[in-house]
């Protein structure tokens, strides 16, 4: 018995294509690239029907439906734009992922363009079906920092967003009587990591043992401008506290530490990471100008004892900053060796300040970042961490501030963070 003539579906074909079909003949219905066979609301690659003894076909011819990749996956810290009109998500449609600039940028300079493939998945030429990654930009404040004229600016108020990497670290040990509470500064390196000085996070013991404070006792504030108003700031608890294993409490050698935040912080105009320098044992060049910010000493007559006894009271409500030149290593070493007391300026430190002293040359909290503008990448790089200074008041003549030389610890920092791609590489453009 002969079965009726078959019409292939729109965007499809039937095989074999014959003039006549008889009992037991079978045909395979398939669709063009980018289309799927649809039968009873079920999608399939092919569908077979057979000519029955009574001259009818075993099934109706199915339809061919265009492949739909459906709504593309959400991109963390990213946006999606549809290149095809009506926001189509069907075969050959195109979408573009982009990152929330200027706070995030796409890893590997990916185009972010994805096309709906015949298989029904969004595909990128390089990444395939994997989504791109948006990584934090570093060292680019939303407000441009002041031009580095060679003059100290003592205790100047920092505008909000000028130091978006600045973190206030508050340590409160409630297990001790009376409660121990102190503060320091740090610098945001990625959405999850803060760089600071080890002595800020060392448990305050009377002996020389180096034990980190319990992570439960650490709170980090980011995007903070005025300590009296923490409402606009992001506060985070610590997931990990990592002190450099060789930190020496007696001479403050290797005074560097990291805090991993409990949750990654959202970046924005007031919260952005600073860039790490290239590993460079020489450290920053003498006479280069850097900036240090902090809620610390803004009164040149405050002594170290007074700072310690002030407890949690920060000495400045609004974030202050100062501009300081790097001091030649030999000069700084000599200035400390000439003092009574056992001062050791090691190869893991550098000094900054002015010979003549002056107001606020040691402004800034322990652990705060000494940042230098890197001409190569056009970004701010953390070259130092506020570490220690002489016994005299802030700003005394020839008492330079001593900073941890961050560029000696690049490998250590990366190793602790364990995520080579958690910090974006600074783009360097001609």
């Amino acid at each position: 018995n002969e079965c009726p003539e078959l019409q292939p579906p729109v965007h499809g074909k039937i095989e074999p294509s014959q003039a006549k079909y008889f009992f037991k003949d079978q045909v395979l219905v398939s669709c063009d690239t980018g289309y799927k066979v649809l039968k009873d609301n079920v999608e399939m690659d092919t569908f077979q029907i057979e000519c029955l003894k009574d001259g009818t076909w075993s099934n109706k011819i199915p339809t061919c439906k265009i492949v739909d990749c459906r709504a593309p996956g959400e991109l963390e810290h990213g946006l999606i734009t549809f290149s095809t009109r009506n926001n189509l998500t069907t075969y050959k449609s195109e979408i573009k992922y982009s990152c929330q600039e200027p706070y995030y940028k796409m890893l590997n300079n990916n185009t972010g363009i994805y096309t709906c493939s015949a298989q029904g998945v969004w595909m990128n030429k390089v990444l395939g079906r994997s989504l791109p990654t948006c990584l934090p930009e570093c060292g680019q404040p939303s407000r441009s920092l002041p031009s580095l004229v060679k003059r100290i600016i003592g205790g100047r108020n920092a505008e909000p967003g000028l130091f978006p990497w600045q973190a206030l670290i508050v340590v409160e040990d409630t297990s001790r009587v009376p409660n121990d509470k102190w503060f320091g500064s740090g610098a945001l390196l990625s959405a999850s990591w803060i760089l600071t000085a080890a002595h800020v996070l060392r448990s305050q013991r009377r002996d020389t043992t180096v034990i980190p404070v319990s992570k439960e006792h650490v709170t980090v504030y980011l995007g903070l401008h005025d300590v009296r108003d923490k409402s606009g700031a992001v506060n985070s608890s610590a997931a990990r506290v990592v002190l450099h294993p060789d930190f020496n409490i007696q001479n403050y050698n290797h005074d560097i530490a990291l805090v991993q935040l409990q949750e990654p912080v959202p970046l924005g105009p007031h919260v952005m990471p600073v860039c790490l320098p290239r590993l460079e044992p020489e450290g920053p060049a003498p006479h280069m100008l850097g900036l240090v910010a902090g809620w610390g000493i803004s009164n040149p007559n405050v002594t170290v004892d007074e700072i310690i006894s002030s407890g949690t009271r920060t000495l400045s409500d609004v974030l202050q900053y100062v501009k300081l030149p790097v001091v030649p290593h030999a000069e700084c070493k000599t200035s400390y060796e000439s003092r009574s007391g056992n001062y050791s300026v090691t190869e893991n430190m550098f000094c900054a300040g002015y010979y003549e002293g002056g107001k606020d040359t040691c402004l800034g909290d322990s652990g705060g970042a000494f940042v230098i503008f890197d001409d190569l990448s056009q970004r701010w790089v953390v070259q130092g961490l506020v570490s220690w200074g002489g016994p005299e008041e802030c700003g005394s003549k020839q008492v330079y501030g001593v900073y941890t030389k961050v560029s000696n610890y690049v490998d250590w920092v990366w190793e602790q963070m364990g995520l080579p791609q958690s910090v974006v590489e600074p783009q360097v453009e001609r």
């Epitope: 044992p281 190569l376 690049v410 080579p420």
Partner: antibody, heavy 120, light 107 residues
Framework: QVQLKQSGTELMKPGASVNLSCKAS????????IEWVKQRPGHGLEWIGE????????NYNENFKDRATFTADTSSNTAYMQLSSLTSEDSAIYYC?????????????WGQGTLVTVSS | DIVMTQSQKFMSTSIGDRVSVTCRAS??????LAWYQQKPGQSPKALIY???YRFSGVPDRFTGSGSGTDFTLTISNVQSEDLAEYFC?????????FGSGTKLEIK
């Protein structure tokens, strides 16, 4: 994934110049230093120098400063090293390499090497 | 320039043994030292950086130690695939310099 693909074997005459290429893929080319390393049998490895493709900044080993020139084409993600005034001492395998992190100075990724033979 | 000395050009070992390759710097390089493995006809591969950090994917039988001027690469439970040449490299000062290499051979 990070890949560095180097140009093929070169047979050169003494006094000539050779231009070696190193095509990078799988990362942001402009942000990482490209290192060049020479290896002669029985002479171990010798660092020639480095270039930061994004800025064109270079650092050379004094032993090669007068004869090696590094360039980078950011449109094709390719770094080049030109070595001039070749002698038989320059017969070696030349590698390009890249650090793991943008801030590091040890070499995590290496090209397959280009063999240069200098012979009259 | 900083001279990196690998005094042993060859070292004989047996499968399953523990072997230590040493490297000495002519001046203090801090922790800024890397170890590489190179097999015949292949490019060098990074094993250890910052004197003691193992590069990703490197088996934990490879350990690095030392700081300043004296460094050691230790391979415990040597496997046949470890037979190769090992180079140290300082990256503390320009120019970066490599040791002359130590070849690991089977007894």
């Amino acid at each position: 994934q990070v890949q560095l693909k180097q140009s093929g074997t070169e047979l050169m005459k003494p006094g000539a110049s050779v231009n070696l290429s190193c095509k990078a893929s799988g990362y942001t080319f402009t942000a990482y230093w490209i290192e060049w390393v020479k290896q002669r049998p029985g002479h171990g490895l010798e660092w020639i120098g480095e270039i930061l493709p994004g800025s064109g900044t270079t650092n050379y080993n004094e032993n090669f400063k007068d004869r090696a020139t590094f360039t980078a084409d950011t449109s094709s993600n390719t770094a080049y090293m030109q070595l001039s005034s070749l002698t038989s001492e320059d017969s070696a395998i030349y590698y390009c390499a890249r650090s793991y992190y943008y801030a590091s100075r040890w070499f995590a990724f290496w090209g397959q090497g280009t063999l240069v033979t200098v012979s009259s | 320039d900083i001279v990196m000395t690998q005094s042993q050009k060859f070292m004989s070992t047996s499968i399953g043994d523990r072997v230590s390759v040493t490297c000495r710097a002519s001046q203090n390089v801090g922790p800024n030292l890397a170890w590489y493995q190179q097999k015949p006809g292949q490019s060098p591969k990074a094993l250890i950086y910052s004197a003691s950090y193992r590069f990703s994917g490197v088996p934990d039988r490879f350990t690095g130690s030392g700081s300043g001027t004296d460094f050691t690469l230790t391979i415990s439970n040597v496997q046949s695939e470890d037979l190769a040449e090992y180079f140290c490299q300082q990256y503390n000062r320009y120019p970066f310099t490599f040791g002359s290499g130590t070849k690991l051979e089977i007894k």
